[in-house]
């Protein structure tokens, strides 16, 4: 009889179930870019295919300049894969000649930009050491969490060295957000 | 991986039309842009226009009204129809898939993956 | 349409030379410039996007640089498989023109 008494408000409570296909996402893959002057303490923001191969932005959630720009207030559970490569031989070089240009560490940050907030934001990031690895290296490095976001939220993806990012493939290096 | 397969070679009288396919494997046209260029003797490439992914065409000005692209996704092939042929139309004409890229802010199109050519010859 | 005008229009050179080709385009293409190598019989070949970016598996002689409307392509040691006809391409705007082509000569 409690349960009975206790359906009706029950129902009340919880709204409707949104079907998954209304809700904003994002699947963005790699391309080709080349490297621009940045700020010494600023990892540089990648670009990423919107459109072509298979990246798509469905239900308002849109890409520009950069930017993944949330549409709707929520948790979303937001994720990127980034494949460096390089040569060895260039961690040899910074060992015995101090060389700075070359990294002996490689960097992915997801950054979260909010016009209200003067300061981005970093909600993961993920390092690698690049200087143990054979001859012709290849390291992905992976992040993925979830975030309560807000409408006009904007995300975007940084890494310590845009030379080194593999391009060579769409299933190599992404970037991507959908609302739970 | 990427391949464009394009059709053999065809000789044609003038004012007459020729259709060239370019069957791609690795990837599916409705989702990259298929452009046509040409080469014809001693002279240079000449881009003619692109098979958009999601179906439009833009065709150079200079064959407007000539040229036709078209597309048949369930085998995964572009068509260059180009018609009322000249001997000056007599070209190697290529299907290439374009790929993006960006400097700055800007982003811009280059044809990384190239078909293997089709000679088309223009005699009477 | 935008015009690209590369010079010269031939180069004669032998193994191990330097070697540069120069494109201009007719209008500011912001660096929206592609270099192809094309060889008789083949298909043409990306070597540059972006002005100077290195297409991947493309060997490190090959550079390239510039901006505005004046772009270079370099190859710093001539080797034989290298003689072709190259071709710059604007990637900036419908028609995407190519530059009529430079043809490299063994010397």
């Known amino acids: 009889l409690k349960g009975q008494e206790f359906a009706p408000s029950h129902q009340q409570v919880y709204a409707p179930l949104r079907a998954d296909g209304d809700k904003p996402r994002a699947h963005l893959t790699v391309v080709r870019q080349t490297p621009t002057q940045h700020f010494k303490n600023q990892f540089p923001a990648l670009h990423w295919e919107h459109e072509l191969g298979l990246a798509f932005t469905k239900n308002r959630m849109n890409y520009t300049n950069k930017f993944l720009l949330i549409p709707e207030s929520g948790d979303y559970f937001i994720y990127s894969q980034v494949t460096f490569r390089g040569m060895t031989s260039e961690c040899s070089e910074i060992r015995q000649a101090g060389r700075p240009n070359k990294p002996d560490s490689i960097t992915v940050v997801i950054t979260k930009v909010t016009d209200s907030y003067p300061e981005p934001t970093q909600l993961l990031m993920g390092t690698k050491s690049v200087c143990e690895v054979g001859s012709n290296w290849f390291q992905p490095i992976y992040l993925g969490a979830m975030f309560s976001l807000q409408e006009g939220d904007k995300l975007m993806v940084n890494v310590s060295d845009i030379s080194l990012v593999d391009y060579t493939k769409e299933d190599k290096t992404f970037f991507g957000a959908f609302l739970l | 991986q990427v391949q464009l397969v394009q059709s053999g070679a065809e000789v044609k009288k003038p004012g007459a039309s020729v259709k060239v396919s370019c069957k791609v494997s690795?990837?599916?046209?409705?989702?990259?842009?298929v452009h046509w260029v040409r080469e014809a003797p001693g002279q240079g490439l000449e881009w003619m226009g692109v098979m958009w992914y999601g179906g439009n065409t833009d065709y150079n000005s200079k064959f407007q009204g000539r040229v036709t692209m078209t597309r048949d996704t369930s085998t995964n092939t572009v068509y260059m129809e180009l018609s009322s042929l000249r001997s000056e139309d007599t070209a190697v004409y290529y299907c290439a898939r374009a790929g993006r890229y960006y400097v700055d802010s800007n982003y811009y199109w280059d044809f990384p993956y190239w078909g293997q050519g089709t000679l088309v010859t223009v005699s009477s | 349409d935008i015009q690209m005008t590369q010079s010269p229009s031939s180069v004669s050179a032998s193994v191990g030379d330097r070697v540069t080709i120069t494109c201009r385009a007719s209008?500011?293409?912001?660096?929206?410039l592609a270099w192809y190598q094309k060889k008789p019989g083949k298909s043409p070949k990306l070597l540059i996007y972006g002005a100077s970016s290195l297409q991947d598996g493309v060997p490190s002689r090959f550079s390239g640089s510039g901006s505005g409307t004046d772009y270079t392509l370099t190859i710093s040691s001539l080797q034989p498989e290298d003689f072709a006809t190259y071709f710059c391409q604007e990637g900036l705007k419908s028609p995407y023109t190519f530059g009529q082509g430079t043809k490299l000569e063994i010397k």
């Open positions: 690795g990837f599916s046209v409705t989702s990259y842009n």
């Open positions: 209008e500011d293409i912001y660096s929206g």
